[in-house]
C-alpha cells in the first residue's frame, strides 16, 4: 500500500519515541565516528521534518523516499571527508547507489575506544539528570560499535537498560542491583549483535534463498504443529523484516516486525501453543519473546518421510517442476521432526537430498538411484554429533579458560596468517560454547553448539573480509554458508606458513599486568600463546603447556614482589630465554 509521504507514514505507525530512536540508530550505524551531539542534531531535524509531513503530506519534500531524506541529511555532515575519507564519495551518487555505498562502508571493527563503565553513582546521577539523553547515548554507543545490530531489538535493550537504572538507582545497594543487570545486558547484546550479523551476511553474501532456507528450518523446529503454508508465510515476512534491517531500512523493518508480531498473536492456534505468554506483553517485549520462544511439542504420529520423498513415483517430477516448494517442504518436514539437529545440519541434509535428486532424476532408473538417499545422511549427522561429544568432553576436562587455549592453538595452527587480536577474540568466543551448550541435555546440545559456532565463525569471516590474509579462510567463508563450520573443522596445520620471527618485545611484560582484571589477564596470556604458536607452529601441546605454566608462575611471582616492575625487568628475559629453549 503506497503512501503520499513515506516519512509521515512511518512516524504515525511507530510513534515519536520509536521513530527518533530508530533514526538515531540508523545514523549511528552509518556514521560510526560522528560525535553524539551531531547525531542528536540530525535526528531532531529529521523528526521536525517528519512532523511537518504528518501535518501536511503534500508539503515540500515529504514525497521523497526515506533513503533520499536520510542520505541527504547524512551528506550535510561538515567533516564527512576528513572523518570518513572515501565514504564521502557516496554523497556524489544518486539513490539507490548512495545507500548501497553507505552500507558497504559500514565498519564491523570500528576504531572506537572500549566502553568504560563509570561508577554506579555517576551513572545514576546522569540517568536522573537527563534520562532521555542518557538512553539516547546508550543507543548511539551500541549502534556505532555494532553497525548491523537488529534495530527494533536494540530499542528493547534500551527499554531494559532504562528499567535497570529506574529500579537500581533507588536501591539500597545500587551496585549490587545494577552491575549484574548491566553485565547481562552487555553479554546478551553482544550475542544478539553477532546473531544478527550472521543473518545479514546470509542475506548479503548468499542471497535471500539462503536466508529463507535457514528460516524454514528454524521456524519448522519452533512450530512443528504449523502447516507448511503457515511456516512459508512467516518465512516470507521474516525475510522482508531482516532484509530491511540489514539494508538500513530501519523504520520499515521495525514497522514490519510489529506487523509480524501482531499476525502471529492473532493466529496462535495455527502456529504454536507456546505463543500465549508472549502475546500479552507490550510491543518490544512481545517481539523479543516471539523471536526467542521455545520449540512447541512435535505432533504425535508424524508419518515417515520416506513415503513422500523416496518411495513416491512423483519425487522427480515434483522436484523438477518446483524445486523451491518441493525442497522447502522436505526441509520443513525434516526440521519439524528434528529439533535435536542444528539448523546448519538440516540445511546440509536438504542440500544432499537436492544433489542426489539432481544426479538421479535424469537417470534410467531414478528410484534405484536415489533409494538409499536417507542412508547417505548418516555421516552428515554423525560428524557434528561426534564433534560436539569430543569438544564437550575436552571442555569438561579442561574448564573454560584452558579449553579456549586449546582452541587458540588449534585455530592458530589452521590459519596462522590471521591477526592475533582476531584469533584471540574468535577462539575465546568459540570456547564459550562449552559453558553455553555442554551442560544441556543431549537433544539440545547439537543445535546449541553448531548454530552458536556458525555465529562465531561468521565474525571471523566478517573481520577477515575487511583485511583478507588467508586463502583458506576466504575459501571456507565464501564457498558455502552451511559448510563453513565443517570447512574450518577440516583445516589442518598450514604447512605452507613461514613461522613468524621471534620478537622479544611481544613477550615483554610490565607491572601493569598485576592490576588487570582476570579477563584482561587471560587475554594477555592468550595473546602470548597465539604469538608462540605463530613462532613455533609445530610446537607440541606439552611444550606449549610448559611455557604457559612458566608464564603464569612468572606473572604470579612478580605480582607478589615488592618491586613489581624490577621483577618483570629481571625475570622477563629469563622467561623468554627459557621459553625459546623449551620450544627449540
Amino acid at each position: 500500500d503506497t503512501h503520499k509521504s513515506e516519512v509521515a507514514h512511518r512516524f504515525k505507525d511507530l510513534g515519536e519515541e520509536h521513530f527518533k530512536g530508530l533514526v538515531l540508530v540508523a545514523f549511528s550505524q552509518y556514521l560510526q565516528q560522528c560525535p553524539f551531539e551531531e547525531h542528536v542534531k540530525l535526528v531532531n531535524e529529521v523528526t521536525e521534518f517528519a512532523k511537518t509531513c504528518v501535518a501536511d503530506e503534500s508539503a515540500e519534500n515529504c514525497d521523497k523516499s526515506l533513503h533520499t531524506l536520510f542520505g541527504d541529511k547524512l551528506c550535510t555532515v561538515a567533516t564527512l571527508r576528513e572523518t570518513y575519507g572515501e565514504m564521502a564519495d557516496c554523497c556524489a551518487k544518486q539513490e539507490p547507489e548512495r545507500n548501497e555505498c553507505f552500507l558497504q562502508h559500514k565498519d564491523d571493527n570500528p576504531n572506537l575506544p572500549p566502553l568504560v563503565r563509570p561508577e554506579v553513582d555517576v551513572m545514576c546521577t546522569a540517568f536522573h539528570d537527563n534520562e532521555a539523553t542518557f538512553l539516547k547515548k546508550y543507543l548511539y554507543e551500541v549502534a556505532r560499535r555494532h553497525p548491523y545490530f537488529y534495530a527494533p531489538e536494540l530499542l528493547f535493550f534500551a527499554a531494559r537498560y532504562k528499567a535497570a537504572f529506574a529500579e537500581c538507582c533507588q536501591a539500597a545497594d545500587k551496585a549490587a542491583c545494577l552491575l549484574p543487570k548491566l553485565d547481562e545486558l552487555r553479554d546478551e547484546g553482544k550475542a544478539s549483535s553477532a546473531k544478527q550479523r550472521l543473518k545479514c551476511a546470509s542475506l548479503q553474501k548468499f542471497g535471500d534463498r539462503a536466508f529463507k532456507a535457514w528460516a524454514v528450518a528454524r521456524l519448522s523446529q519452533k512450530f512443528p504443529k504449523a502447516e507448511f503454508a503457515e511456516v512459508s508465510k512467516l518465512v516470507t515476512d521474516l525475510t522482508k523484516v531482516h532484509t530491511e534491517c540489514c539494508h538500513g531500512d530501519l523504520l520499515e523493518c521495525a514497522d514490519d516486525r510489529a506487523d509480524l508480531a501482531k499476525y502471529m498473536c492473532e493466529n496462535q492456534d495455527s502456529i504454536s501453543s507456546k505463543l500465549k505468554e508472549c502475546c500479552d506483553k507490550p510491543l518490544l517485549e512481545k517481539s523479543h519473546c516471539l523471536a526467542e520462544v521455545e520449540n512447541d511439542e512435535m505432533p504425535a504420529d508424524l508419518p515417515s518421510l520416506a513415503a513422500d520423498y523416496v518411495e513416491s513415483k512423483d519425487v522427480c517430477k515434483n522436484y523438477a517442476e518446483a524445486k523451491d516448494v518441493f525442497l522447502g517442504m522436505f526441509l520443513y518436514e525434516y526440521a519439524r521432526r528434528h529439533p535435536d539437529y542444528s539448523v546448519m545440519l538440516l540445511l546440509r541434509l536438504a542440500k544432499a537430498y537436492e544433489a542426489t535428486l539432481e544426479k538421479c532424476c535424469a537417470a534410467a532408473d531414478p528410484h534405484e538411484c536415489y533409494a538409499k538417499v536417507f542412508d547417505e545422511f548418516q555421516p552428515l549427522v554423525e560428524e557434528p554429533q561426534n564433534l560436539v561429544k569430543q569438544n564437550c568432553e575436552l571442555f569438561e576436562q579442561l574448564g573454560e579458560y584452558k579449553f579456549q587455549n586449546a582452541l587458540l592453538v588449534r585455530y592458530t595452527k589452521k590459519v596462522p596468517q590471521v591477526s592475533t587480536p582476531t584469533l584471540v577474540e574468535v577462539s575465546r568466543n568459540l570456547g564459550k560454547v562449552g559453558a553455553k551448550c555442554c551442560k544441556l541435555p543431549e537433544a539440545k546440545r547439537m543445535p546449541c553448539a553448531e548454530d552458536y559456532l556458525s555465529v562465531v565463525l561468521n565474525r571471523l569471516c566478517v573481520l577477515h573480509e575487511k583485511t583478507p590474509v588467508s586463502e583458506k579462510v576466504t575459501k571456507c567463508c565464501t564457498e558455502s554458508l552451511v559448510n563453513r563450520r565443517p570447512c574450518f573443522s577440516a583445516l589442518e596445520l598450514d604447512e605452507a606458513y613461514v613461522p613468524k620471527a621471534f620478537n622479544a618485545e611481544t613477550f615483554t611484560f610490565h607491572a601493569d599486568m598485576c592490576t588487570l582484571s582476570e579477563k584482561e589477564k587471560q587475554v594477555k596470556k592468550q595473546t602470548a600463546l597465539v604469538e608462540l604458536v605463530k613462532h613455533k607452529p609445530k610446537a607440541t601441546k606439552e611444550q606449549l603447556k610448559g611455557v604457559m605454566d612458566n608464564f603464569a608462575a612468572f606473572v604470579e611471582k612478580c605480582c607478589k614482589a615488592d618491586d613489581k616492575e624490577a621483577c618483570f625487568a629481571e625475570e622477563g628475559p629469563k622467561f623468554v630465554a627459557a621459553s625459546q629453549a623449551a620450544l627449540a
Partner: antibody, heavy 121, light 110 residues
C-alpha cells in the same frame, strides 16, 4: 565418437506438423537425458524441452501443448513432434545431451549440427 | 517472467585483449545453475562453463566464469583468434520449464 544427428527439417505450411528426429551414435541413449533447443535466424537460443532417460518429459511454458518429445531407445533416437506450426517457429532445431549427473541444469555437452525448419506459405 | 539479459550485445576487441561479458538474471538462478556457451557461425553451441565457474574439460584456462545469484561474468583473459564467436549464458531456475538462454554477445575483431 559420440554423435547426435538431427533430421526431418524442411519447409512446412503454417498450421502444419513436422516430426524431427535426433539419432544418437557412440553411446547407449537409454542412459541419457536429451533436450531440444532452437535458434531463429540471428536470434537467441530457446530451450524447448527435455526427455529424461526414464521417458519423463518437461517443456518450456510456451511449448506445452504444441510440442511433444518422445524416444525410442531401441533405435537410439529421440523425436520432437511439432503441431500447429507458425511462422515464428522458423528456426534451426538442435538436440543436445544434458551433462551426465545433472537432471534439471542447463548444461548441454553434446549437440547435433541442427536441422532447419521453415514455416511459410 | 524470467529475464536473462546479456551485455554488451556485441564487443569489438583485438587479439590479446581481456574481454568481459555479463549476464543478469531475474529472478536469481537456482543453485548457481548457470552455463556459458560459445557458438561460431553455422555451428552448434559448445559448452564452456557450468555451475557459473567450472570449466568444461578441454576448454582453455583463459576462459573463466564468476558470479552468483543474479549477476554473472564470463572473462576471456587474453583473446585468441579462435575466440571470435558469439557467447550465450544459460540459466536454470526453480522450475525446469523456465530454463532460459541469454540473447548472446558477439565478440568481433576490432
Amino acid at each position: 565418437e559420440v554423435q547426435l544427428l538431427e533430421s526431418g527439417g524442411g519447409l512446412v505450411q503454417p498450421g502444419g506438423s513436422l516430426r524431427l528426429s535426433c539419432a544418437v551414435s557412440g553411446i547407449d541413449l537409454s542412459n541419457y537425458a536429451i533436450n531440444w533447443v532452437r535458434q531463429a535466424p540471428g536470434k537467441c537460443l530457446e530451450w524447448i524441452g527435455i526427455i529424461w532417460a526414464s521417458g519423463t518429459t518437461f517443456y518450456a511454458t510456451w511449448a506445452k501443448g504444441r510440442f511433444t518429445i518422445s524416444r525410442d531407445n531401441s533405435k537410439n533416437t529421440v523425436y520432437l513432434q511439432m503441431n500447429s506450426l507458425r511462422a515464428e517457429d522458423t528456426a534451426v532445431y538442435y538436440c543436445a545431451r544434458t551433462v551426465p549427473g545433472y537432471s534439471t541444469a542447463p548444461y548441454f555437452d553434446l549437440w547435433g549440427q541442427g536441422t532447419l525448419v521453415t514455416v511459410s506459405s | 517472467d524470467i529475464q536473462m539479459t546479456q551485455s554488451p550485445s556485441s564487443v569489438s576487441a583485438s587479439v590479446g585483449d581481456r574481454v568481459t561479458i555479463t549476464c543478469q538474471s531475474s529472478p536469481s538462478v537456482w543453485s548457481n545453475f548457470l552455463s556459458w556457451y560459445q557458438q561460431k557461425p553455422g555451428k552448434a553451441p559448445k559448452l564452456l562453463i557450468y555451475e557459473a565457474s567450472k570449466l568444461t574439460s578441454g576448454v582453455p584456462s583463459r576462459f573463466s566464469g564468476s558470479g552468483s545469484g543474479t549477476d554473472f561474468t564470463l572473462t576471456i583473459s587474453s583473446l585468441q583468434p579462435e575466440d571470435f564467436a558469439t557467447y550465450y549464458c544459460g540459466g536454470g531456475y526453480s522450475s525446469i520449464s523456465d530454463t532460459t538462454f541469454g540473447c548472446g554477445t558477439k565478440v568481433e575483431i576490432k
